[in-house]
């Protein structure tokens, strides 16, 4: 907190300019009018104030706007944004995508800070949903943004926004998140033809159910092993050897290298060894010939 002292003669700031970087903190406090600062915020970012000096400028704005800054000021905060606390940001009403972009630009190249997370939360809540333009912007700055949302939050993403999602945006998503995103992607891409559809839906398949995988196996998609390994185990288990062979196409040979890993390991345990042998890959661990497989879950459902 800077002590209140009178501004020295001739030092009263007439405008926000480069000369102010030579002011000590107490001089900035005494000689810069808060209303002048607010109207000339766009200049602050171009002036190399130290972080300590920025603290003083923030203090002046806080006094002028105790209920939270107006968007006209927020949009031009620049480096001053780095001085804001999540508590400060919760007082804001940010509605313009341009304002959001301007503030994300300041934090570019850094991890998502609590300030940025709060800003995004305020913005998205204000809009009511994660529309395509917002999602485009957020994933451009933070490729992992989508996967930082809870399944509940993801449920507010409209299918039309899915077009903005790139494969790398889903890299850190867990199965629960993909469970929410997959049906939206399926809906978004439903009018595309086979091969184009597969290219778009591929990164979302970690949320696909068995029946959709069976359908894909009929379309010569040649799924790569990396995608196959990310499928839900419970969705892969009911697939037959023939279906997996069709699904993977030439990539089926990769199963051998993954036979000890899920979901391949668990899938092998469910297949007849005879059927596995037809692949000619030397996969072991299937059900020996002559054994009868009882599906107990089916039996429970009937009783």
């Amino acid at each position: 907190e800077v002590e209140k002292t009178a501004c020295p003669s001739g030092k009263k700031a007439r405008e926000i300019d480069e000369s102010l970087i030579f002011y000590k903190k107490w001089e900035l406090e005494a000689c810069v009018d808060a209303a002048l600062l607010a109207t000339q915020m766009d200049r602050v970012n171009a002036i190399p104030f130290t972080y300590e000096q920025l603290d003083v400028l923030k203090h002046k704005l806080d006094e002028l706007y105790p209920q939270g800054y107006p968007e006209s000021v927020i949009q031009h905060l620049g480096y001053l944004f780095l001085k804001m606390s999540p508590e400060d940001i919760r007082k804001w009403n940010v509605t313009s995508l341009e304002t959001l972009k301007a503030l994300l630009e300041v934090n570019k190249g850094h991890e998502m800070s609590p300030q940025v997370a709060t800003l995004i939360d305020r913005f998205v809540k204000g809009r009511g949903q994660l529309d395509k333009d917002t999602l485009d912007t957020l994933t451009a700055f933070y490729p992992g943004y989508l996967c930082s949302l809870s399944p509940e939050e993801l449920s507010s993403v409209p299918p039309s926004s899915i077009w903005a999602v790139r494969p790398q945006d889903l890299d850190t998503c867990d199965p629960r998140q993909l469970d929410v995103l997959y049906p939206k992607a399926r809906l978004a891409f439903q009018n595309m033809n086979g091969s184009e559809y597969f290219v778009k839906i591929q990164s979302f398949l970690g949320g696909a159910p068995t029946e959709d995988l069976k359908a894909l196996s009929q379309q010569n998609v040649s799924m790569d092993l990396a995608t196959f390994m990310k499928l839900r185990t419970d969705a892969v288990l009911p697939l037959t050897v023939a279906e997996v062979q069709k699904l993977l196409g030439p990539h089926v040979e990769g199963l051998k290298a993954e036979e000890r890993h899920r979901p391949v390991r668990d899938w092998i345990l469910r297949q007849r060894q005879d059927d596995l042998d037809t692949l000619g890959l030397g996969l072991q661990g299937g059900i020996p010939n002559g054994y009868l497989v009882l599906d107990l879950s089916m039996q429970e459902a009937l009783s």
Epitope: I21, P48, F49, T50, Y51, E52, Q53, L54, Y79
Partner: nanobody, 115 residues
């Protein structure tokens, strides 16, 4: 990694002269605006002088006419020539890239002026 090493400080009598040097590495020196900051014991950080990449210079009112900032791009060095020194110039002097927005921080070089 940005590195700035200040030197040239020392103890002199009022009215005498000192020349501080700051040698930089780890960034494009000739594209950078540089500044000298100082902090006297018990006082706050103060910007003394700046030199921009185009060579234009600025000074705090308290040192105008007495201090001169300059740079040698070939040596990645910025200088502060201090003349007519006064006891109130006693401080730790640090150089910074203006883009860092850090001000007084780090080692610096101590300048002590006795009357």
């Amino acid at each position: 990694e940005v590195q700035l090493v200040e030197s040239g400080g020392g103890s002199v009598q009022a009215g005498e002269t000192l020349r501080l040097s700051c040698t930089a590495s780890g960034f494009t020196f000739d594209d950078s605006d540089m500044g000298w900051y100082r902090q006297a014991p018990g006082d706050e950080c103060e910007l003394v002088s700046t030199i921009s990449s185009d060579g234009s210079t600025n000074y705090a009112d308290s040192v105008k006419g007495r201090f001169t900032i300059s740079q040698d791009n070939a040596k990645n060095t910025v200088y502060l020539q201090m003349t007519s020194l006064k006891p109130e110039d006693t401080a730790i002097y640090s150089c910074r890239t203006m883009a860092s927005r850090i001000g007084c921080w780090g080692q610096g070089t101590l300048v002590t002026i006795s009357s």
